[in-house]
């Protein structure tokens, strides 16, 4: 078997709001993968996990199922977003998102993904990680390629 | 308005103990962890540790392990940092600071302690 | 640990001038940046948070800038109350530590 390679492209979008009674922050982030199969038989994507970390704790979780099937040296686009809540013992965090005085909120956070891969019975998996500035001040989408967006996010319990 | 209030300077002999203290207003006690730093005279300045008072989750610098010990008493929005064993070294100004996302926001007016005998 | 590294250690200038003080980490510390200044006998102040953003009261003539390892920070036109000695400090993660120190005086 050749190689499967995915490639994490990046932030696309990030849509924020808040409960300032809670001073909680809510970023659901849109991330892009690539995924290229380079065999000459067809690949089951079984599944993507994601799981977002703000300073070392993890703000969000997600899942997507039986996702798609990748054709013989073929590539796909997949976009998955992950639901994200900064609160309790990161609560000034609403101070910095909520700040008049500066344009960009840009905060830093650690994206992890693993894809889970599936051919002949045989399954296989491939782990990212990258740091990403996201902006929690205001609702931003980001210049990626245009992609299929697969909306069947089942957040992990 | 954010203040961060320490308690006097202080004159303390060779190996014994110094408790000073930081007294937060202003702003939710504990929505921000406190950071404690120390400088020698005319030197940078040093990290000792933090202390967040909405856990009570503290971190300390490897380097002061073992001498510095943060406490809080939250009824009074109040961290202490406690310096042991005493030596001519630990002769400096303490200095307390709000953690802000980036940066300390606000800094108490500084502890000054002198180890002599 | 990383290292903050800050140049130049001392800066001899005259009111008016324009200086800029830089601060190298040993590694990335993604925008985890601030800075300080401080007077004689006197608690440090925050200047500038995030390696870009002025805190609150902060003159226009200050600015931050820079990512990844490499940070500066710009005075322009220096007033007399702007004399006493700059810091950078990186909480990327702990122990947060804090360059040696910019000594701006008086030419």
């Known amino acids: 078997p050749r190689s499967i390679e995915v490639k994490y492209i990046g932030v696309k979008s990030a849509y924020v709001s808040y409960d300032a009674e809670k001073r909680t922050i809510y970023l659901n982030i849109t991330n892009t993968l690539n995924i290229t199969n380079n065999n000459y038989y067809s690949v089951e994507v079984e599944n993507i996990t994601a799981q977002v970390q703000f300073s070392k704790t993890v703000i969000g979780k997600a899942r997507l199922n039986n996702i798609t099937n990748i054709g013989p040296l073929d590539m796909k686009q997949i976009d998955y977003t992950v639901p994200t809540v900064i609160a309790e013992e990161m609560s000034y965090m609403y101070d910095f998102c909520t700040l008049l005085s500066i344009k960009v909120h840009n905060i830093v956070l650690m994206m992890q993904v693993t894809v889970t891969t599936a051919y002949f019975g045989h399954s296989e998996q491939i782990s990212q990680e990258r740091y990403q500035y996201v902006d929690c001040g205001r609702n931003t989408t980001y210049q990626l390629a245009q992609s299929e967006y697969l909306n069947v996010l089942q957040p992990q319990q | 308005q954010v203040q961060l209030q320490q308690s006097g300077a202080e004159l303390v002999k060779p190996g014994a103990s110094v408790k000073m203290s930081c007294k937060a207003s202003?702003?939710?006690?504990?929505?921000?962890?406190i950071e404690w730093m120390k400088q020698n005279h005319g030197k940078s300045l040093e990290w000792i540790g933090n202390?967040?008072?909405?856990?009570?989750?503290?971190k300390y610098n490897e380097k002061f392990k073992g001498k510095a010990t943060l406490t809080v008493e939250k009824s009074s929005s109040t961290v202490y940092l406690e310096l042991s064993r005493l030596t001519s070294d630990d002769s400096a100004v303490y200095y307390c600071?709000?953690?802000?996302?980036?940066?300390?926001?606000?800094w108490g007016q500084g502890t000054s302690v002198t180890v002599s005998s | 640990d990383i290292q903050m590294t800050q140049s130049p250690a001392s800066l001899s200038v005259s009111v008016g001038e324009t200086v800029t003080i830089t601060c190298r980490a040993s590694e990335n510390i993604y925008s985890s940046l601030g800075w300080y200044h401080q007077k004689q006998g006197k608690s440090p102040q925050l200047l500038v948070f995030a390696a870009t953003n002025l805190a609150d009261g902060v003159p226009s003539r200050f600015s931050g800038s820079g990512s990844g390892t490499q940070y500066s920070l710009k005075i322009n036109s220096l007033q007399s109350e702007d004399f006493g000695t700059y810091y950078c400090?990186?909480?990327?993660?702990?122990?947060?530590?804090f360059g040696g120190g910019t000594k701006l005086e008086i030419k």
């Open positions: 202003g702003y939710t006690f504990t929505t921000f962890p």
């Open positions: 600071a709000r953690y802000f996302y980036g940066g300390m926001d606000y």
């Open positions: 400090q990186h909480l990327w993660s702990v122990p947060w530590t």
């Open positions: 202390f967040h008072p909405y856990n009570d989750d503290t």
